[in-house]
Amino acid sequence: CKAMHVAQPAVVLASSRGIASFVCEYASPGKATEVRVTVLRQADSQVTEVCAATYMMGNELTFLDDSICTGTSSGNQVNLTIQGLRAMDTGLYICKVELMYPPPYYLGIGNGTQIYVIDPEPCPDSDF
């Protein structure tokens, strides 16, 4: 299938609230396009799907209601936010982009963004 370049940052540090955001950028041939974006997590040579959304250029990007991902699109960029992350979720998050319409179908897979998640230290009990 036709390959497409996808760019994403190498490293992102999640916030103390377990939220990580990064931009996934791809090369699209036009405005009349429908795009499917999938976030994959690679850890210990296992690849699992984190979330996915299909959207038309110029329309909002909508994930399923129970998804841990949210996002917005602007031109050939998708701004992805993953929430509810914990230290055990540290890993390589790969952005996969498919140009579903118009034909021909294109597929692009980024090199991945290493997301580091550090669980916040519990607040010590304070005695007064």
């Epitope: 299938c1 405005k31 009349a32 429908e34 038309m56 110029g58 034909p103 021909p104």
Partner: antibody, heavy 120, light 112 residues
């Protein structure tokens, strides 16, 4: 229920222009591409092009470039196709149709068609 | 452009009998993603076309299961197990592997 209702039949003279409308209802207009298809009398189907209702972006059959212009008005959920410099071989029924991603971008709902007759 | 060729041009069938329509594409419609970008539409007399089959072998919603479709990358067959009077019309195959989308010339199914 999903409906695509097209404007009525038109009779035009050669060299004139015509604008055909396609009013969508029963679904979110900006969630689906609209395609346009030509069917000359007694002939088969010919794809003209499509339009993304969100931003007006189009894909078109090179054969119809300079002939057909596709536009939308999101506020009234309507797609338009304007045909310019009409000739006798533009005489045809023109259909609008909705693309459905669940059917891998097949045309799942069609308008009733608009007959455009070009005659001097 | 991908050329879609259908045969026969006309198909007279007795009600209750099976029918078969062939479609050939000038290029393989089987993509490396595993999807075959082949569709079938039916245009009943005086009506707009309607979708029958998508992705070569999947029935669209509301299409009776007497319809089926199969094929390879370039050769496809639409079968009706038992033809009914309401099946009359012109059947078109179509592809959307590449732009422009193209249709076959049509096969007219009529009742004997």
């Amino acid at each position: 229920q999903v409906q695509l209702v097209q404007s009525g039949a038109e009779v035009k003279k050669p060299g004139a222009s015509v604008k055909v409308s396609c009013k969508a209802s029963g679904y979110k207009f900006t969630d689906h591409f609209i395609n346009w298809v030509k069917q000359a009398p007694g002939q088969g189907l010919e794809w003209i092009g499509d339009i993304n209702p969100n931003n007006g972006g189009t894909n078109s059959n090179q054969k119809f470039e300079g002939k057909a212009t596709l536009t939308v008005d999101k506020s009234i959920s309507t797609a338009y196709m304007e045909l310019r410099r009409l000739r006798s071989d533009d005489t045809a029924v023109y259909y609008c149709a909705r693309l459905r991603r669940e059917y891998f971008y097949a045309m799942d709902y069609w308008g009733q068609g608009t007959l455009v007759t070009v005659s001097s | 452009d991908i050329v879609m060729t259908q045969s026969p041009l006309s198909l007279p069938v007795t009600p209750g009998e099976p029918a078969s329509i062939s479609c050939r594409s000038s290029k393989s419609l089987l993509h490396s993603n595993g999807i075959t970008y082949l569709y079938w539409y039916l245009q009943k007399p005086g009506q707009s076309p309607q979708l029958l089959i998508y992705q070569m072998s999947n029935l669209a919603s509301g299409v009776p299961d007497r319809f089926s479709s199969s094929g390879s990358g370039t050769d496809f067959t639409l079968k009706i197990s038992r033809v009914e009077a309401e099946d009359v019309g012109v059947y078109y195959c179509a592809q959307n592997l590449e732009l422009p989308l193209t249709f076959g010339g049509g096969t007219k199914l009529e009742i004997k």
